[in-house]
């Protein structure tokens, strides 16, 4: 005789709203095996029994959570196999607050995961990330759990909130932090992530004074044309392949400023470009370390900057100045950013 359950796992996680079939079958040398599911809640799925097999269909409702047992018998011999079914809900519904962070302020950031099940601190974890690393020095405040207001009865989904007090984001501040929420289930790990952009000063590498009327730039790592009027490089994952950077920067209206483009394919070359009319020139005025150690090419409204020998850009601030007018654009390049190798 052979007794089989498919899928064979003793624990199965099912996303809410999705269906799953668990087939239990048995072959019998002398006659037909009798196979049936027991330990079923009246609402736990539906069973279709055939000669020698029984199919349990789970509809992906929270009420489907349970541990049914398949029992197979052949003559005097019997076998059984239990399956722990866990129905979970983990939609990509993260909400962060505030919408952006201001460097130089002691502040609390919160991250809420909506419509979650199970609402178990042991299965759901929150992390505040800088690049791919946990933000050192952030202090986790107490988590909160509240039941969501449901339109339909019988679906007790929850929202879970984690708050952190932020350490000083440093000078210069990073372009963004990320809230990462991970749900750990039997043989399944799910993760969602939400960006929390950091406001950046447009005109100075110093951290912004919160009382100043300086315009700010809101940097975002969403992909768009690689044109910048300020800080716009986000930390890349530490493991290849590295995505090509193509950030978008949202800025307040202001004077015509030079724009900085990055070309990762060219071994980290930066191009500063002015398009504010004729007679405008641009030049690089600031780079990490000594500006003289970089390779510069300046041609009127365009100025290039690259590292010699070719390699990753040094972490820190790059500044390009436009004349006449003296408007500057600052770009922050974080550390450990390695360009794609040319192929």
């Amino acid at each position: 005789q052979s007794f089989q359950v498919n899928p064979p796992e003793s624990e199965v996680a099912v996303a809410m709203g999705t269906s799953l079939q668990i087939t239990c079958s048995m072959s019998c040398d002398e006659g037909v095996a009798r196979v049936h599911w027991r330990g079923l809640d009246t609402s736990l799925g539906s069973v279709q029994t055939l000669p020698g097999s029984s199919i349990l269909s789970v509809r992906g409702m929270l009420s489907d959570t349970g541990t049914p047992v398949c029992v197979g018998s052949c003559g005097s011999r019997s076998f059984q196999h239990s399956v722990k079914i866990l129905v979970y809900a983990f939609p990509d519904q993260l909400v962060v607050s505030p919408e952006f962070l201001v460097p130089g302020q002691d502040q609390v950031v919160s991250c809420t995961a909506h419509n979650i099940w199970p609402a178990d601190p042991n299965s759901l974890s929150f992390a505040l990330l800088l690049g791919e690393q946990r933000l050192e020095g952030a202090q986790a405040l107490e988590p909160e759990q509240e039941e969501e207001i449901q339109e339909a009865e019988g679906t007790p989904l929850f929202r879970m909130t984690q708050r952190w007090r932020l350490p000083s984001l440093g000078t210069p501040a990073p372009p963004a932090l990320h809230c990462q929420v991970t749900m750990q289930l039997p043989k399944l790990v799910l993760t969602h992530r939400k960006e929390i952009p950091v406001l950046q000063s447009q005109t100075s590498p110093k951290p912004p004074n919160t009382t100043s009327a300086e315009p700010y730039i809101l940097t975002s790592s969403s992909t768009a044309e690689a044109v910048s009027t300020g800080l716009n490089i986000t930390t890349l994952p530490s493991a290849p392949p590295y995505p090509k950077l193509s950030p978008r920067t949202l800025s307040s209206e202001g004077p015509c400023r030079p724009k900085i483009h990055q070309d990762l394919e060219a071994g980290w070359e930066l191009l500063c470009e002015a398009s504010c009319g004729p007679g405008v020139t641009v030049r690089w005025t600031l780079a990490p370390g000594d500006l003289a150690t970089y390779h510069k090419r300046e041609a009127g409204a365009q100025a290039w900057l690259s590292v010699l020998p070719p390699g990753p850009m040094v972490e820190g601030w790059f500044q390009c100045r436009q004349d006449p007018g003296g408007e500057v654009t600052n770009l922050y390049v974080p550390g450990q950013v390695t360009p794609n190798s040319s192929s």
Partner: antibody, heavy 119, light 107 residues
Amino acid sequence: EVQLLESGGGLVQPGGSLRLSCAASGFTFSDFWMHWVRQAPGKGLEWVSYISGDSGYTNYADSVKGRFTISRDNSKNTLYLQMNSLRAEDTAVYYCARDRPYYYYMDVWGKGTTVTVSS
Amino acid sequence: DIQMTQSPSSLSASVGDRVTITCRASQSVSRSLAWYQQKPGKAPKLLIYAASSLQSGVPSRFSGSGSGTDFTLTISSLQPEDFATYYCQQYKSYPVTFGQGTKVEIK
């Protein structure tokens, strides 16, 4: 000089109430989160509650949740702890402590005030 | 909650001795750990923060080390005024928690 000075302790019967105060001086009080920490006789330190500088965030140890309320009056540079439904196990020296922004350790402590809950 | 366990709970030492107190967290607290000194009838006094940074005004014979779950407070040469109880505290997440204390007594 940065100073914290607690007051309001005393002897109270079980089920009774008491309000502790902590007067701060020598620093911009509203810029700092503040804590209450207690120490039962012969025992170790136990964190009780915190409050943020603008009173927007508060939290309590499970042992006092629903019975104690932390508050502050930034115009008076004073921190408060309203203690209701007091129990014998709340007997302790209560300290107020200042929280260091960006690092979150308690860098300045008051001298403490003694609360005795006994019939 | 994160549990903090100090060892030993008490120790006897002489003036001039090198004293080491350990503190273990039940889960990683990174470097979010402070050490306090408390004398009888007095308030705790901050010695070390961020695991190894010496608080202003604290003698340099005090030092801290460690990260993650295992931390150490060292007094390089014990002085008469150092006889006291020492507490570690994690402030990585709430509720903040203290070790049970280590009493340093005169031998």
